[in-house]
Structures are given as structure tokens and as C-alpha cells.
């Protein structure tokens, strides 16, 4: 673990409330093949131990949808990913918008600092798959 | 090599006959900028040699695709990635459909263990792109 | 330095005239959370300075763009990843369109060398958002 | 707090139509979906069809060709018309307000229900 | 369509006991993570009301007493201890595909 090979591959447990964007991550061996090795989770979001850059990536599909699906509902889904704490770091990393697809992924690399807590926020009206298959949220410490 | 730095980085080779959903693979450098280093194929599978967590991606593109081609055909067309064996280990690793779009990408972090075989199923009456900067699919070890 | 973890994120900084179907890139700590450590930009083209297989990845989203955005436009709106000199060893590396969606991201791993200069090229009518969370595009030395 | 008021009316006569108004409060036409669902003795409860926030309706394959769903928004008013009715249609007709999540497909608020008697 | 079939038709529970409904669907009704299965309670001239949604998810100001379990075809609504107020015919719903189905119902009644 010295390396600082800090690493972390989640499932989705559920959403939040409804004022509450946040998605809600899980993690371990137990839940199927999530982990975390080195960061940590509090509350459900994930929060970085180790300073460096990160590849962050993400994929979240949209619960029994259908291309049709995304168009009926008038708020457009939209997934961001980013630091939400501490306050001063936080910041916008990574943001995607469903449009008429059911599934958004991508991947980014990017600086983070020990104790930056990442928050995967989705706005809309759509509850997401908790298929592990589907809906999955990692990052991978790369350099210092 | 002793590293565990194995990856690979493949190409379309072909699709299977009408009831094998598999897409087969080929890599190398007399075929463009595809490789194998550690990890090898097995008729066209891409077969793991060392135990560890992978970054696993990939990119299909349907060919001579318009927004309107993937709307006309009746069962979606879906992109699974998977461990197809040793059957004790079988599981969908990543899944996607293309609803309205004509490509799929994505990427995850997964544990591998020496002698799983990843299967790349394409679903649907769609052929895919074998356009190699199209459609492609790796695996890169990043730890242990 | 000397491990070789060449590593790059970049920023849109802007588009190129109009037969110039370039995007060029920015990136430093002090325009955000862009960086470049170890390859170069050129004139807003990203310049590699070590060989090895490098990680490349790219999320492009379009300025002010809904899902009917795209299908207004009569010619397709493609994302292409190549290097673009030395000349002989021009060649697309990643290709995407947006179709009826307004972002595109992918990823893959490719072999670079010493002085591959990386073009993104980005075709059609529509112009890129410039947002660092929407559009971005980075490359990672992974191996030798 | 939501509320969904039905008015329309109680007798319609065979092969006419039925047109009932659903007005809303508590909550936005804009952000959340409206379904309609009726309740006879001999058929129990059916989803006759929905309108989403955007406007877009899907309605049950049964009833497709003579249901209509519409809406005004600033008025936080939902339209029903079905058409040409038969005594099989007599039933009490509810509105109800799907939950937050879009594509949950339930019903957390009804209206108190119009009784409609399709008789000459 | 999803055919939902309730059972029983009727119950007569005594007070503080157990009351099981059962509800079983022609197809799986669980997708993407999630059982697609809700649960209303109607009495004599209301509207239904929920009372679960996703199979198990109590709704907002229902009484913990109202527990839903199940995935795939075959699910349970159980209440207890049962209360005088609880008299009431109960319906699944489930919302997997369109279109939404109801059971055909299954009256309560408080001995």
C-alpha cells in the first residue's frame, strides 16, 4: 500500500432524498466485485486518503429506460461528478448529460488531496440502475 | 514483464455465426497499433495470465450507423462484457445499449484472476464497425 | 520524472478557423485543473515527449446543445483522435459522432513515440462547450 | 399540500364522450406526471394512461384510439376525454400524481374519483 | 400485459395478529436492481393509497406495521399487528413495463 497505489471500484446503493442529488456508493467484496484500497467511504461518498493524481471514471444507466424514456421527462438528467468537501475545494470535475440515451460514461484524470470528498450528483427525475454491470464509480491513483 | 505491467489492446476481428453473440478479437503489430503483452487470445477471447485489478475498456461502433438505424430495429442492440470462463467465475462485468447512438465506451476496474476469459457480447441484428479506430477493446493491469 | 509517468489533462482553449477543423488545448494549474507533466503542447496540439503505450482518453461536449441540437445539422458531428505529425506516422486513433447526443468520451490505449504530435479534430457545424468539466482531453504513459 | 380535484360529469350517454378535469395543487404540472386510472366492479383497477411533465403521453393499448390526455400548465389543470362510451365504461375514473422519480410508475396521490354511469 | 394475481380474495384477521397478502405476476417484475411491485390500501369509497413502492420501501407516513418483501414473480404484503383501521381491500401494482397492472384485490377484514 506504500506505493500509494490507492484504488476504489463502486456499486450503487441507493439515492438520496428527494432534495438530495447525491447517488449513494458501496463497496467491498462481500457486495460482488467493488472495492476500495485506500480511500474510504463516509456516508456513502467516497473520500480520497492520499494525495496525487487520480483517474476518476464513472457509468450510471437510467432504471427501465428506453430511448424515449429520457425525452418524456421535461428536466433534463444530468450526472456530475465532483468535489464536495471540504468547501473550498469544491468544484465541478466531470459533467454528462443523458439527452435521449439511457447510459452516460466517461473518465477523467485529475488532482486530489486527502480528504477531498467526491460527490456523483444526478438531477432528473429518473432513478438509476443498481445493476453492478450498470452502474459502477471508481478512481485509480496514477502519480503523485 | 515481471512487473505485472501486462495489458493488450485489441481489434475487431469478425463477429460469430448467428446464435454466438461473442465478438472475436485479434491483436498485434502487423495488424496496426493492437498488442498483446501478457495477456493472450484464445480463438479470438482474450484469455488473463496474471491475478490483479484491470482497467477494462472498450469502444464498439455500429457500422454504417445513422441515429435512425438503431431505432429501427426492434430488439435493442446491447454490448456486454464479461467473464465467460472458467463457468464458476461467469459474470457481466460491463453492459451497455445503444439505444439511439451508434457507439458505445466505457471503461471499469475489475479483479481478474489468471485464466478468466472475457467475452465482449454483442446482442441485437446490428454488425459492428471493424474500423480500428471504431471498435476496440483492452485490458490494462494496475495493481495487484 | 525519470519512472516515466509522462501525464497530461488538458482544457479546451478554442477552435481553429474555419478550414481548421483542429480543437486547441490549454493546460496549467494556474487555468484550473489542467496539467502537463512530461508531453508538451504545440501551438494548442499535444506533443508527446516519451515513448510507451499511453491511456488516451476525450470527453467533447457541444456548446448550448440539446439531443435535437445534433439532428438539425445535416453533416454528422464527428470527434477524431489521431496523430497528425510526424506525417508518416499519421493515423486516427479514436473516431466518435454525436448522432442525436450532444457528448461524446472514450478511452483507449494506444503505442505513442517521442514526437507524435495528437490532434483532435472535431468536424461538422457545432461548436465545443468550453466548460473543463464537459470538455476535456488527457493522456497517460501506462508502459514501455 | 397535494391536492388533485376532479370535476366532470356523472351521466354520459352511449357512443359520447367523457371529459373530466383533473386540477392540481401542492405540486407542478412541470415536474411531475399525471396518470389516469378507473375502478369497476367487474374489471378492478386500470391504468388508462399517463401525461409526463414534457407533455408526452403514453396510454394503454386497450383505449389508445378513442383516450386523450392534455394539459395547461399554468392553470395546474389535467384534461381526460375518451370517446365513445359504452356501458362496460362505467366506472369511477381517478387521477393520481406519480412520485418524484419519473420512471417509478406509481401513484403516491389520487383525486377523490368521479363516478361516471354510461346509460341512456 | 403483466398479469398480477392476488390471494386470498379475502381474509378475516383477529386484532394484534398477522395479516399476509399474497401477489404473484406472470413475468418477473424486477429490473435494473429494483422490484418494480407497489402496494395500495383502499377503503369503501377513497381513492387507494400507497403505502410500499419498490416492493419493500414503506411511503411517507405509513404505520411500520405495513412491511412488503418478494422479487422476480412472488411477493408479500404483511401487516402486524393488525389494526381496526386496517380493514381495508388491498392491491399490488407493478410499473416494470407499460402498461402498469393491478391485482385484482384482496379484502381485509378485522375479527
Known amino acids: 500500500e506504500s506505493l500509494g497505489w490507492d484504488i476504489a471500484e463502486l456499486q450503487l446503493n441507493h439515492t438520496g432524498p428527494q432534495q438530495d442529488p447525491r447517488l449513494y456508493w458501496q463497496g467491498g467484496p462481500a457486495l460482488g466485485r467493488s472495492f476500495l484500497r485506500g480511500p474510504e467511504l463516509d456516508k456513502g461518498q467516497l473520500r480520497i486518503r492520499r494525495d496525487g493524481i487520480y483517474m476518476v471514471h464513472i457509468q450510471v444507466t437510467l432504471a427501465i429506460c428506453s430511448s424515449t424514456s429520457t425525452s418524456r421527462h421535461h428536466h433534463p438528467t444530468t450526472l456530475a461528478v465532483g468535489i464536495c468537501s471540504p468547501a473550498s475545494r469544491s468544484i465541478s470535475l466531470l459533467r454528462l448529460s443523458f439527452h435521449q440515451g439511457c447510459t452516460i460514461a466517461s473518465q477523467r484524470l485529475t488532482p486530489l488531496a486527502r480528504g477531498d470528498t467526491l460527490c456523483t450528483n444526478l438531477t432528473g427525475t429518473l432513478l438509476p440502475s443498481r445493476n453492478t454491470d450498470e452502474t459502477f464509480f471508481g478512481v485509480q491513483w496514477v502519480r503523485p | 514483464e515481471s512487473l505485472g505491467w501486462d495489458i493488450a489492446e485489441l481489434q475487431l476481428n469478425h463477429t460469430g455465426p448467428q446464435q454466438d453473440p461473442r465478438l472475436y478479437w485479434q491483436g498485434g503489430p502487423a495488424l496496426g497499433r493492437s498488442f498483446l503483452r501478457g495477456p493472450e487470445l484464445d480463438k479470438g477471447q482474450l484469455r488473463i495470465r496474471r491475478d490483479g485489478i484491470y482497467m477494462v475498456h472498450i469502444q464498439v461502433t455500429l457500422a454504417i450507423c445513422s441515429s435512425t438505424s438503431t431505432s429501427r430495429h426492434h430488439h435493442p442492440t446491447t454490448l456486454a462484457v464479461g467473464i465467460c470462463s472458467p463457468a464458476s467465475r461467469s459474470i457481466s462485468l460491463l453492459r451497455l445499449s445503444f439505444h439511439q447512438g451508434c457507439t458505445i465506451a466505457s471503461q471499469r476496474l475489475t479483479p481478474l484472476a489468471r485464466g478468466d476469459t472475457l467475452c465482449t457480447n454483442l446482442t441485437g441484428t446490428l454488425l459492428p464497425s471493424r474500423n480500428t479506430d471504431e471498435t476496440f477493446f483492452g485490458v490494462q493491469w494496475v495493481r495487484p | 520524472e525519470s519512472l516515466g509517468w509522462d501525464i497530461a489533462e488538458l482544457q479546451l482553449n478554442h477552435t481553429g478557423p474555419q478550414q481548421d477543423p483542429r480543437l486547441y488545448w490549454q493546460g496549467g494549474p494556474a487555468l484550473g485543473r489542467s496539467f502537463l507533466r512530461g508531453p508538451e503542447l504545440d501551438k494548442g496540439q499535444l506533443r508527446i515527449r516519451r515513448d510507451g503505450i499511453y491511456m488516451v482518453h476525450i470527453q467533447v461536449t457541444l456548446a448550448i446543445c440539446s439531443s435535437t441540437s445534433t439532428s438539425r445539422h445535416h453533416h454528422p458531428t464527428t470527434l477524431a483522435v489521431g496523430i497528425c505529425s510526424p506525417a508518416s506516422r499519421s493515423i486516427s486513433l479514436l473516431r466518435l459522432s454525436f448522432h442525436q447526443g450532444c457528448t461524446i468520451a472514450s478511452q483507449r490505449l494506444t503505442p505513442l513515440a517521442r514526437g507524435d504530435t495528437l490532434c483532435t479534430n472535431l468536424t461538422g457545424t457545432l461548436l465545443p462547450s468550453r466548460n473543463t468539466d464537459e470538455t476535456f482531453f488527457g493522456v497517460q504513459w501506462v508502459r514501455p | 399540500q397535494v391536492q388533485l380535484q376532479q370535476s366532470g360529469p356523472g351521466l354520459v350517454q352511449p357512443s359520447q364522450s367523457l371529459s373530466i378535469t383533473c386540477t392540481v395543487s401542492?405540486?407542478?404540472?412541470?415536474?411531475?406526471?399525471v396518470h389516469w386510472v378507473r375502478q369497476s366492479p367487474g374489471k378492478g383497477l386500470e391504468w388508462l394512461g399517463v401525461i409526463w411533465s414534457t407533455g408526452i403521453t403514453d396510454y394503454n393499448a386497450a383505449f389508445i384510439s378513442r383516450l386523450s390526455i392534455s394539459k395547461d400548465n399554468s392553470k395546474s389543470q389535467v384534461f381526460f376525454k375518451m370517446d365513445s362510451l359504452q356501458s362496460d365504461d362505467t366506472a369511477i375514473y381517478f387521477c393520481?400524481?406519480?412520485?418524484?422519480?419519473?420512471?417509478?410508475?406509481?401513484?403516491?396521490?389520487w383525486g377523490q374519483g368521479t363516478s361516471v354511469t354510461v346509460s341512456s | 400485459d403483466i398479469v398480477l394475481t392476488q390471494s386470498p380474495a379475502s381474509l378475516a384477521v383477529s386484532l394484534g395478529q398477522r395479516a399476509t397478502i399474497s401477489c404473484r405476476a406472470s413475468k418477473s417484475v424486477s429490473a435494473s436492481g429494483y422490484t418494480w411491485m407497489h402496494w395500495y390500501q383502499q377503503k369503501p369509497g377513497q381513492a387507494p393509497k400507497l403505502l410500499i413502492y419498490?416492493?419493500?420501501n414503506l411511503e411517507s407516513g405509513v404505520p411500520a406495521r405495513f412491511s412488503g418483501s418478494g422479487s422476480g414473480t412472488d411477493f408479500t404484503l404483511n401487516i402486524h399487528p393488525v389494526e381496526e383501521e386496517d380493514a381495508a381491500t388491498y392491491y399490488c401494482q407493478h410499473s416494470r413495463e407499460l402498461p402498469p397492472t393491478f391485482g385484482g384485490g384482496t379484502k381485509l377484514e378485522i375479527k
Open positions: 393520481a400524481r406519480n412520485p418524484h422519480y419519473g420512471n417509478l410508475n406509481a401513484m403516491d396521490y
Open positions: 401542492g405540486f407542478s404540472l412541470t415536474t411531475y406526471a
Open positions: 419498490l416492493a419493500s
